[in-house]
Interface confidence: medium
Protein backbone atom coordinates (compact mmCIF):
# COMPACT_ATOMS: atom_id res chain seq x y z
CA UNK A 1 0.00 0.00 0.00
CA UNK A 2 1.23 3.43 -0.93
CA UNK A 3 1.37 6.13 1.71
CA UNK A 4 -0.55 9.36 1.09
CA UNK A 5 0.87 12.75 2.00
CA UNK A 6 -0.98 16.02 2.63
CA UNK A 7 0.78 19.34 2.05
CA UNK A 8 -0.49 22.89 2.11
CA UNK A 9 -0.92 23.94 -1.54
CA UNK A 10 0.60 27.39 -1.04
CA UNK A 11 2.85 29.10 1.46
CA UNK A 12 3.53 32.80 1.00
CA UNK A 13 6.64 33.89 2.86
CA UNK A 14 7.20 37.49 3.96
CA UNK A 15 10.21 36.72 6.12
CA UNK A 16 13.14 34.57 5.04
CA UNK A 17 12.00 31.40 6.73
CA UNK A 18 9.18 28.90 6.41
CA UNK A 19 7.90 25.73 8.01
CA UNK A 20 6.41 23.13 5.70
CA UNK A 21 4.44 20.27 7.26
CA UNK A 22 4.05 16.91 5.54
CA UNK A 23 1.25 14.84 7.04
CA UNK A 24 1.36 11.14 6.18
CA UNK A 25 -1.30 8.43 6.24
CA UNK A 26 1.09 6.21 8.16
CA UNK A 27 2.51 6.04 11.66
CA UNK A 28 6.05 7.41 11.57
CA UNK A 29 7.05 5.43 14.63
CA UNK A 30 8.30 2.83 12.22
CA UNK A 31 11.76 1.50 12.75
CA UNK A 32 13.87 3.24 10.12
CA UNK A 33 12.65 5.94 7.77
CA UNK A 34 14.04 8.64 5.53
CA UNK A 35 12.10 11.90 5.20
CA UNK A 36 13.08 14.29 2.45
CA UNK A 37 11.96 17.50 0.76
CA UNK A 38 12.44 18.08 -2.95
CA UNK A 39 12.33 21.27 -5.03
CA UNK A 40 11.08 21.64 -8.58
CA UNK A 41 8.37 20.18 -10.79
CA UNK A 42 10.54 17.11 -11.41
CA UNK A 43 11.86 16.99 -7.83
CA UNK A 44 15.32 17.72 -9.21
CA UNK A 45 16.83 19.14 -6.03
CA UNK A 46 16.88 17.33 -2.68
CA UNK A 47 16.57 20.29 -0.33
CA UNK A 48 16.59 18.58 3.03
CA UNK A 49 16.70 15.03 4.34
CA UNK A 50 16.31 13.44 7.75
CA UNK A 51 17.03 9.84 8.64
CA UNK A 52 14.71 8.85 11.44
CA UNK A 53 14.45 5.95 13.79
CA UNK A 54 12.01 4.79 16.43
CA UNK A 55 14.52 5.41 19.19
CA UNK A 56 16.08 8.73 18.25
CA UNK A 57 15.23 12.05 16.65
CA UNK A 58 16.31 12.25 13.02
CA UNK A 59 19.36 14.21 12.00
CA UNK A 60 18.36 16.65 9.26
CA UNK A 61 20.91 17.81 6.73
CA UNK A 62 20.49 20.26 3.89
CA UNK A 63 21.63 20.79 0.37
CA UNK A 64 24.45 23.37 0.22
CA UNK A 65 22.07 25.93 -1.26
CA UNK A 66 19.63 25.68 1.67
CA UNK A 67 19.50 25.90 5.44
CA UNK A 68 17.12 23.41 6.99
CA UNK A 69 16.11 21.59 10.11
CA UNK A 70 13.17 19.41 10.91
CA UNK A 71 11.05 17.58 13.42
CA UNK A 72 8.53 14.77 13.41
CA UNK A 73 5.75 13.22 15.44
CA UNK A 74 3.56 10.17 14.82
CA UNK A 75 2.34 11.23 11.41
CA UNK A 76 3.89 14.56 10.49
CA UNK A 77 7.34 15.66 9.35
CA UNK A 78 7.94 19.41 9.51
CA UNK A 79 10.77 20.94 7.54
CA UNK A 80 12.01 24.39 8.55
CA UNK A 81 13.89 26.38 5.92
CA UNK A 82 15.58 29.71 6.56
CA UNK A 83 17.73 32.31 4.75
CA UNK A 84 15.37 31.96 1.80
CA UNK A 85 15.59 34.24 -1.21
CA UNK A 86 13.23 35.12 -4.04
CA UNK A 87 14.89 32.60 -6.33
CA UNK A 88 13.89 29.82 -3.93
CA UNK A 89 10.26 30.37 -4.99
CA UNK A 90 9.21 27.01 -6.46
CA UNK A 91 7.11 23.91 -5.85
CA UNK A 92 8.29 21.59 -3.06
CA UNK A 93 7.44 17.92 -2.57
CA UNK A 94 7.52 15.84 0.61
CA UNK A 95 8.81 12.29 0.43
CA UNK A 96 8.90 9.54 3.03
CA UNK A 97 10.61 6.17 2.69
CA UNK A 98 10.36 3.34 5.21
CA UNK A 99 13.69 1.61 4.80
CA UNK A 100 13.41 -1.18 7.34
CA UNK A 101 11.95 -3.62 8.26
CA UNK A 102 10.75 -5.06 4.96
CA UNK A 103 8.84 -4.28 2.91
CA UNK A 104 10.23 -0.95 1.69
CA UNK A 105 7.44 1.64 1.43
CA UNK A 106 7.25 5.17 0.10
CA UNK A 107 4.53 7.73 -0.51
CA UNK A 108 2.43 8.55 -3.53
CA UNK A 109 3.61 11.80 -5.09
CA UNK A 110 1.59 14.69 -3.68
CA UNK A 111 0.47 17.86 -5.45
CA UNK A 112 3.29 19.67 -3.68
CA UNK A 113 3.47 23.04 -1.98
CA UNK A 114 4.25 26.22 -3.84
CA UNK A 115 6.49 28.30 -1.61
CA UNK A 116 6.37 31.90 -2.73
CA UNK A 117 9.08 34.06 -1.21
CA UNK A 118 8.13 37.72 -1.45
CA UNK A 119 10.78 40.18 -2.41
CA UNK A 120 11.64 42.63 0.35
CA UNK A 121 11.18 46.26 -0.64
CA UNK A 122 12.56 49.06 1.49
CA UNK A 123 9.74 51.56 1.62
CA UNK A 124 10.80 55.23 1.68
CA UNK A 125 8.01 57.72 2.38
CA UNK A 126 8.22 60.27 -0.39
CA UNK A 127 7.48 63.84 0.58
CA UNK A 128 5.68 65.77 -2.11
CA UNK A 129 7.91 68.41 -3.66
CA UNK A 130 7.17 72.01 -2.78
CA UNK A 131 6.12 74.18 -5.58
Amino acid sequence: NKILVKQSPLLVVDSNEVSLSCRYSYNLLAKEFRASLYKGVNSDVEVCVGNGNFTYQPQFRSNAEFNCDGDFDNETVTFRLWNLHVNHTDIYFCKIEFMYPPPYLDNERSNGTIIHIKEKHLCHTQSSPKL
Epitope: K31, P102, P103
Partner: antibody, heavy 118, light 113 residues
Framework: QVQLQQSGAELARPGASVKLSCKAS????????MQWIKKRPGQGLEWIGA????????RYTQKFKGKATLTADKSSTTAYMQLSSLASEDSAVYFC???????????WGQGTLVTVSA | DIVMTQSPSSLTVTAGEKVTLSCKSS????????????LTWYQQKPGQPPQLLIY???TRESGVPDRFTGSGSGTDFTLTISSVQAEDLAVYYC?????????FGAGTKLELK
Protein backbone atom coordinates in the same frame (compact mmCIF):
# COMPACT_ATOMS: atom_id res chain seq x y z
CA GLN B 1 33.26 -1.38 15.31
CA VAL B 2 30.13 -3.51 15.37
CA GLN B 3 30.58 -6.77 17.25
CA LEU B 4 28.14 -9.57 18.07
CA GLN B 5 29.47 -12.01 20.64
CA GLN B 6 27.47 -15.20 21.06
CA SER B 7 27.38 -17.56 24.03
CA GLY B 8 29.17 -20.90 24.07
CA ALA B 9 28.06 -24.33 22.84
CA GLU B 10 25.10 -26.01 24.51
CA LEU B 11 24.42 -29.71 25.05
CA ALA B 12 20.80 -30.39 25.97
CA ARG B 13 18.44 -33.30 26.49
CA PRO B 14 15.35 -33.81 24.32
CA GLY B 15 12.41 -31.87 25.74
CA ALA B 16 14.65 -29.38 27.55
CA SER B 17 15.08 -25.65 26.80
CA VAL B 18 18.16 -23.53 26.11
CA LYS B 19 18.64 -19.78 26.11
CA LEU B 20 21.27 -18.42 23.73
CA SER B 21 22.70 -14.92 24.06
CA CYS B 22 24.13 -12.39 21.64
CA LYS B 23 26.02 -9.46 23.21
CA ALA B 24 26.10 -6.42 20.94
CA SER B 25 28.69 -3.65 21.02
CA UNK B 26 29.96 -0.82 18.82
CA UNK B 27 26.56 0.62 17.87
CA UNK B 28 23.25 1.81 19.32
CA UNK B 29 21.67 -1.49 20.30
CA UNK B 30 18.10 -0.14 20.40
CA UNK B 31 18.19 1.20 16.84
CA UNK B 32 18.68 -1.95 14.77
CA UNK B 33 16.87 -5.23 14.30
CA MET B 34 18.56 -8.34 15.62
CA GLN B 35 17.99 -11.40 13.46
CA TRP B 36 18.39 -15.07 14.35
CA ILE B 37 19.31 -17.73 11.80
CA LYS B 38 19.57 -21.54 11.98
CA LYS B 39 22.17 -23.59 10.08
CA ARG B 40 22.05 -27.39 10.19
CA PRO B 41 24.98 -29.46 8.88
CA GLY B 42 24.64 -30.07 5.17
CA GLN B 43 21.59 -27.83 4.97
CA GLY B 44 20.91 -24.22 4.10
CA LEU B 45 20.28 -21.14 6.22
CA GLU B 46 16.87 -20.66 7.83
CA TRP B 47 15.59 -17.37 9.17
CA ILE B 48 13.99 -17.83 12.60
CA GLY B 49 12.89 -14.32 13.45
CA ALA B 50 13.93 -10.85 14.51
CA UNK B 51 13.56 -8.47 17.42
CA UNK B 52 13.74 -4.70 17.56
CA UNK B 53 15.32 -3.92 20.96
CA UNK B 54 13.99 -0.34 20.92
CA UNK B 55 10.46 -1.51 21.70
CA UNK B 56 10.64 -5.31 21.86
CA UNK B 57 8.76 -5.77 18.57
CA UNK B 58 9.26 -9.31 17.24
CA ARG B 59 8.71 -11.08 13.92
CA TYR B 60 8.89 -14.86 13.47
CA THR B 61 8.70 -17.24 10.60
CA GLN B 62 5.69 -19.56 11.04
CA LYS B 63 7.80 -22.68 11.58
CA PHE B 64 9.51 -21.23 14.67
CA LYS B 65 6.46 -19.74 16.41
CA GLY B 66 6.22 -21.59 19.71
CA LYS B 67 9.72 -23.01 19.30
CA ALA B 68 11.79 -19.82 19.58
CA THR B 69 11.21 -16.82 21.85
CA LEU B 70 13.21 -13.67 21.21
CA THR B 71 13.93 -11.09 23.90
CA ALA B 72 16.37 -8.24 24.38
CA ASP B 73 17.86 -6.52 27.41
CA LYS B 74 18.65 -2.88 26.68
CA SER B 75 20.75 -2.37 29.81
CA SER B 76 23.21 -5.12 28.88
CA THR B 77 22.79 -4.66 25.09
CA THR B 78 22.15 -8.37 24.79
CA ALA B 79 19.65 -10.23 22.63
CA TYR B 80 18.40 -13.66 23.66
CA MET B 81 16.75 -16.59 21.94
CA GLN B 82 15.12 -19.31 23.98
CA LEU B 83 14.48 -22.64 22.25
CA SER B 84 11.95 -24.88 23.95
CA SER B 85 10.88 -28.54 23.72
CA LEU B 86 14.17 -29.44 22.10
CA ALA B 87 14.33 -32.32 19.64
CA SER B 88 17.15 -33.78 17.53
CA GLU B 89 16.20 -31.59 14.56
CA ASP B 90 16.99 -28.53 16.70
CA SER B 91 20.66 -29.54 16.70
CA ALA B 92 22.29 -26.78 14.65
CA VAL B 93 24.47 -23.70 14.72
CA TYR B 94 22.43 -20.60 15.56
CA PHE B 95 23.60 -17.17 14.43
CA CYS B 96 22.53 -13.72 15.46
CA UNK B 97 22.92 -10.96 12.88
CA UNK B 98 22.17 -7.25 12.65
CA UNK B 99 20.56 -5.45 9.77
CA UNK B 100 22.85 -3.13 7.81
CA UNK B 101 21.94 -0.60 5.15
CA UNK B 102 19.50 -2.45 2.93
CA UNK B 103 20.41 -5.97 3.99
CA UNK B 104 18.90 -7.83 6.91
CA UNK B 105 22.11 -9.68 7.71
CA UNK B 106 25.04 -7.31 7.50
CA UNK B 107 26.91 -8.17 10.70
CA TRP B 108 27.02 -11.69 12.13
CA GLY B 109 27.87 -13.32 15.41
CA GLN B 110 30.24 -16.28 15.38
CA GLY B 111 27.43 -18.77 15.98
CA THR B 112 26.42 -21.05 18.86
CA LEU B 113 26.33 -24.82 18.41
CA VAL B 114 23.35 -26.51 20.05
CA THR B 115 23.46 -30.30 20.31
CA VAL B 116 20.36 -32.18 21.42
CA SER B 117 21.17 -35.67 22.57
CA ALA B 118 19.80 -38.19 25.03
CA ASP C 1 6.25 -17.02 1.64
CA ILE C 2 8.74 -16.26 -1.12
CA VAL C 3 10.57 -19.40 -2.24
CA MET C 4 14.17 -18.99 -3.41
CA THR C 5 15.56 -21.63 -5.79
CA GLN C 6 19.29 -21.83 -6.47
CA SER C 7 21.08 -23.79 -9.15
CA PRO C 8 23.24 -25.70 -9.43
CA SER C 9 23.41 -27.13 -5.91
CA SER C 10 27.14 -27.69 -6.37
CA LEU C 11 29.75 -26.75 -8.93
CA THR C 12 33.29 -28.00 -9.46
CA VAL C 13 35.52 -25.33 -10.96
CA THR C 14 39.10 -24.61 -11.96
CA ALA C 15 40.99 -21.56 -10.67
CA GLY C 16 40.68 -18.71 -13.16
CA GLU C 17 37.40 -19.99 -14.56
CA LYS C 18 34.30 -17.80 -14.93
CA VAL C 19 31.40 -19.02 -12.83
CA THR C 20 27.70 -18.19 -12.97
CA LEU C 21 25.32 -19.02 -10.13
CA SER C 22 21.57 -18.77 -10.58
CA CYS C 23 18.83 -17.76 -8.15
CA LYS C 24 15.11 -17.61 -8.89
CA SER C 25 12.38 -16.26 -6.63
CA SER C 26 8.74 -17.37 -6.61
CA UNK C 27 7.61 -13.75 -6.87
CA UNK C 28 9.13 -10.49 -8.03
CA UNK C 29 11.62 -8.87 -5.67
CA UNK C 30 11.47 -5.55 -7.55
CA UNK C 31 10.01 -2.79 -5.42
CA UNK C 32 8.19 -0.27 -7.58
CA UNK C 33 8.69 2.44 -4.96
CA UNK C 34 12.44 2.76 -5.43
CA UNK C 35 13.04 0.43 -8.38
CA UNK C 36 15.37 -1.75 -6.31
CA UNK C 37 15.47 -5.54 -6.30
CA UNK C 38 15.56 -6.77 -2.71
CA LEU C 39 17.86 -9.69 -3.37
CA THR C 40 21.05 -10.27 -1.38
CA TRP C 41 23.98 -12.65 -1.93
CA TYR C 42 26.09 -14.16 0.87
CA GLN C 43 29.23 -16.24 0.93
CA GLN C 44 29.78 -18.79 3.69
CA LYS C 45 33.08 -20.54 4.25
CA PRO C 46 33.36 -23.63 6.50
CA GLY C 47 33.28 -22.80 10.22
CA GLN C 48 32.49 -19.13 9.59
CA PRO C 49 29.33 -17.03 9.58
CA PRO C 50 28.05 -15.92 6.16
CA GLN C 51 29.44 -12.71 4.72
CA LEU C 52 27.44 -10.10 2.83
CA LEU C 53 28.60 -9.84 -0.80
CA ILE C 54 25.91 -8.02 -2.77
CA TYR C 55 22.66 -6.26 -1.87
CA UNK C 56 19.93 -4.78 -4.05
CA UNK C 57 20.80 -7.56 -6.53
CA UNK C 58 23.79 -5.71 -7.97
CA THR C 59 25.36 -3.38 -5.38
CA ARG C 60 28.68 -4.79 -4.22
CA GLU C 61 29.37 -4.42 -0.52
CA SER C 62 32.50 -2.40 0.25
CA GLY C 63 35.61 -4.57 0.44
CA VAL C 64 34.16 -7.26 -1.83
CA PRO C 65 36.47 -7.95 -4.81
CA ASP C 66 35.18 -6.67 -8.14
CA ARG C 67 35.35 -10.16 -9.64
CA PHE C 68 31.97 -10.68 -7.92
CA THR C 69 29.07 -9.23 -9.91
CA GLY C 70 25.36 -9.48 -9.22
CA SER C 71 22.74 -9.00 -11.90
CA GLY C 72 19.11 -9.67 -12.68
CA SER C 73 15.71 -8.22 -11.90
CA GLY C 74 12.25 -9.36 -10.88
CA THR C 75 12.50 -13.09 -10.32
CA ASP C 76 15.76 -14.12 -12.06
CA PHE C 77 19.15 -13.29 -10.57
CA THR C 78 22.75 -14.22 -11.20
CA LEU C 79 25.98 -14.05 -9.27
CA THR C 80 29.03 -14.10 -11.53
CA ILE C 81 32.61 -14.67 -10.42
CA SER C 82 34.74 -13.52 -13.34
CA SER C 83 37.86 -15.46 -12.38
CA VAL C 84 37.51 -17.89 -9.50
CA GLN C 85 40.24 -17.86 -6.87
CA ALA C 86 40.98 -20.61 -4.32
CA GLU C 87 39.64 -18.36 -1.53
CA ASP C 88 36.25 -18.19 -3.29
CA LEU C 89 35.51 -21.83 -2.50
CA ALA C 90 32.44 -21.60 -0.28
CA VAL C 91 28.68 -21.94 -0.25
CA TYR C 92 26.80 -19.04 -1.86
CA TYR C 93 23.29 -18.15 -0.72
CA CYS C 94 20.76 -15.79 -2.22
CA UNK C 95 18.16 -14.28 0.07
CA UNK C 96 14.95 -12.32 -0.32
CA UNK C 97 14.86 -9.09 1.67
CA UNK C 98 11.60 -8.07 0.04
CA UNK C 99 9.24 -8.86 2.90
CA UNK C 100 8.92 -10.90 6.06
CA UNK C 101 9.41 -13.81 6.42
CA UNK C 102 12.93 -13.51 5.06
CA UNK C 103 13.90 -16.54 3.00
CA PHE C 104 17.16 -18.05 1.74
CA GLY C 105 17.95 -20.26 -1.21
CA ALA C 106 19.39 -23.72 -0.43
CA GLY C 107 22.84 -22.55 -1.53
CA THR C 108 25.36 -23.40 -4.23
CA LYS C 109 28.56 -25.10 -3.12
CA LEU C 110 31.65 -24.11 -5.08
CA GLU C 111 34.39 -26.77 -5.08
CA LEU C 112 37.82 -26.90 -6.66
CA LYS C 113 38.75 -29.54 -9.26
Amino acid sequence: QVQLQQSGAELARPGASVKLSCKASGYTFTSYWMQWIKKRPGQGLEWIGAIYPGDGDTRYTQKFKGKATLTADKSSTTAYMQLSSLASEDSAVYFCARNYRYSSFGYWGQGTLVTVSA
Amino acid sequence: DIVMTQSPSSLTVTAGEKVTLSCKSSQSLLNSGNQKNYLTWYQQKPGQPPQLLIYWASTRESGVPDRFTGSGSGTDFTLTISSVQAEDLAVYYCQSDYSYPLTFGAGTKLELK
